[in-house]
């Protein structure tokens, strides 16, 4: 692309945080080998991505965990991936759901989530998942992610 | 994009090959429904994508994997993307991780990883596995690209 | 990329709907959170995504399934993306394979495909899978799309 | 800010063994890599060997690969290169570094001299 000024490249990419705070929406960091291209997509409150432009966005995010069986909830861990547009309702763009593993202590799973989405000037999507607690956090297994088409 | 002579597309998708070494690197080939859009992006020695520009790439691989718990070692299989700079360390840039199917005589599973990435001049891009004997090479069933945003 | 009229963005995501046809093709549908950017690229009865122009596509699909290991089939459950272009036969560009759960009534999986691949004018591409039965279509769980690099 | 300094190096003989310590003072994190380059006399500094400091993969030149072992203690802040079977064209001042990711390779140290000889 090597867009010009008027059309820059908008791309982001964060890094997983682990966090002691109870809500089920993820926490990332711009650490590692993270992408921040511009002021033009910023991480807010380590929680969410939010644009300043409106247009086409490649959205994704990608969470591994390590759950069990026996110590989960019946239901399947569920990772979802949802937008917070000014002045609208919350909404669920993408979910993926696995079923927890049987093995012992627990079993690590991935799974990956993304597509194109249309995004409003000061659109914000971030990742909710069923239990924090059993997101992976070592190099590479978690992360979140957008690019402006 | 369709872009001009100075800002040409760079993309490339390959298809996995089955190696008799014993290496944890992937092998890939041009072959079958495979893209590589230019010079400006080559596959070196069937196992990394090297990029002659610098600039923010969307880098992906899907690996598929066969494996029995008991019949496997106790930790899960994991897939990595890789990236070797000059200068630099080789890094992790994205992990998956499954735990090993109790199914028998061996569990299919498939692993997503995708993201964002600045790339130097002369940086490849290469996807390592626990147990490459593990993979699935079946049409489709594992592959890897890369695309310059 | 904001693209001028010569080379406008073209995109799609479609959201998954529930069948009654016994076809393995999975049906897709215009709403919710859908995204079709212009003519210049349709759902055709509501299977598949046909482009109008020629060039690289990052190509992309999210299946969420249900199923249980002795309720099913031994095969695995299988997502193929496939290509029919015009006077070419149909071809099979990725697949994703995951083994059934033993958790019930079923256990919840979800596969995400994606690559990129050059199409030709008039090319459809689909989706495929071994048992359309067991495909989620919650908010969210099963998708499909493209753009064009 | 993160200060790296590396201890270990020495004089010894062929077939014998040394092992670096690289102690950091400050925060590694989780998602950086650590490593060792080194330099021999009138040649370019080049890669040795270096570890990913969550231990999610080490990696190796060819030309030390099973004879030279790296590894991290996070307790404590520091990397370790153990060398063995160690040979005349191993002399070289050895140098630890913090690949910070996007920030690149963003910390050194100061080198120590391996010197392999009878």
């Known amino acids: 692309m090597q867009k010009g000024d008027q059309n820059p490249q908008i791309a982001a990419h964060v890094i997983s945080e682990a966090s002691s705070k109870t809500t089920s929406v993820l926490q990332w960091a711009e650490k590692g080998y993270y992408t921040m291209s511009n002021n033009l997509v910023t991480l807010e409150n380590g929680k969410q991505l939010t644009v300043k432009r409106q247009g086409l966005y490649y959205i994704y995010a990608q969470v591994t965990f390590c759950s069990n069986r026996e110590a989960s909830s019946q239901a399947p861990f569920i990772a979802s991936l949802c937008l917070k547009s000014p002045g609208r309702f919350e909404r669920i763009l993408l979910r993926a759901a696995n079923t927890h593993s049987s093995a012992k202590p627990c079993g690590q799973q991935s799974i990956h989530l993304g597509g194109v989405f249309e995004l409003q000037p000061g659109a914000s999507v971030f990742v909710n998942v069923t239990d924090p607690s059993q997101v992976s956090h070592g190099t590479g297994f978690t992360s979140f992610g957008l690019l402006k088409l | 994009m369709q872009k001009g002579d100075q800002n040409p597309q760079i993309a490339a998708h390959v298809i996995s090959e089955a190696s008799s070494k014993t290496t944890s690197v992937l092998q890939w080939a041009e072959k079958g429904y495979y893209t590589m859009s230019n010079n400006l992006v080559t596959l070196e020695n069937g196992k990394q994508l090297t990029v002659k520009r610098q600039g923010l790439y969307y880098i992906y691989a899907q690996v598929t994997f066969c494996s029995n718990r008991e019949a496997s070692s106790q930790a899960p299989f994991i897939a990595s993307l890789c990236l070797k700079s000059p200068g630099r360390f080789e890094r992790i840039l994205l992990r998956a991780a499954n735990t090993h199917s109790s199914a028998k005589p061996c569990g299919q599973q498939s692993i997503h990883l995708g993201g964002v990435f600045e790339l130097q001049p002369g940086a490849s891009v290469f996807v390592n596995v626990t147990d490459p004997s593990q993979v699935s090479h079946g049409t489709g069933f594992t592959s890897f690209g890369l695309l310059k945003l | 990329m904001q693209k001028g009229d010569q080379n406008p963005q073209i995109a799609a995501h479609v959201i998954s709907e529930a069948s009654s046809k016994t076809t393995s093709v999975l049906q897709w549908a215009e709403k919710g959170y859908y995204t079709m950017s212009n003519n210049l690229v349709t759902l055709e009865n509501g299977k598949q995504l046909t482009v109008k122009r020629q060039g690289l596509y990052y190509i992309y699909a999210q299946v969420t399934f249900c199923s249980n290991r002795e309720a099913s089939s031994q095969a695995p459950f299988i997502a193929s993306l496939c290509l029919k272009s015009p006077g070419r036969f149909e071809r099979i560009l990725l697949r994703a394979a995951n083994t059934h759960s033993s958790a019930k009534p079923c256990g919840q999986q979800s596969i995400h495909l994606g690559g990129v691949f050059e199409l030709q004018p008039g090319a459809s591409v689909f989706v495929n899978v071994t048992d359309p039965s067991q495909v989620s279509h919650g908010t969210g769980f099963t998708s499909f799309g493209l753009l064009k690099l | 800010e993160v200060q790296l300094v590396e201890s270990g190096g020495g004089l010894v003989q062929p077939g014998g063994s040394l092992r670096l310590s690289c102690a950091a003072s400050?925060?590694?994190?989780?998602?950086?890599?650590m490593g060792w380059f080194r330099q021999a006399p009138g040649k370019e500094r080049e890669f040795v060997a270096s570890i990913e400091w969550d231990g999610g993969g080490a990696y190796y030149a060819d030309s030390v690969k099973g004879r030279f072992t790296i590894s991290a203690d996070n307790s404590k802040n520091t990397a370790y290169l153990q060398m063995n079977s160690l040979k005349p064209e191993d002399t070289a001042v050895y140098y630890c570094?913090?690949?910070?990711?996007?920030?690149?390779?963003?910390?050194w140290g100061q080198g120590t001299l391996v010197t392999v000889s009878s």
């Open positions: 400050g925060n590694i994190f989780i998602n950086n890599a």
């Open positions: 570094a913090r690949d910070g990711g996007t920030y690149g390779m963003d910390v």
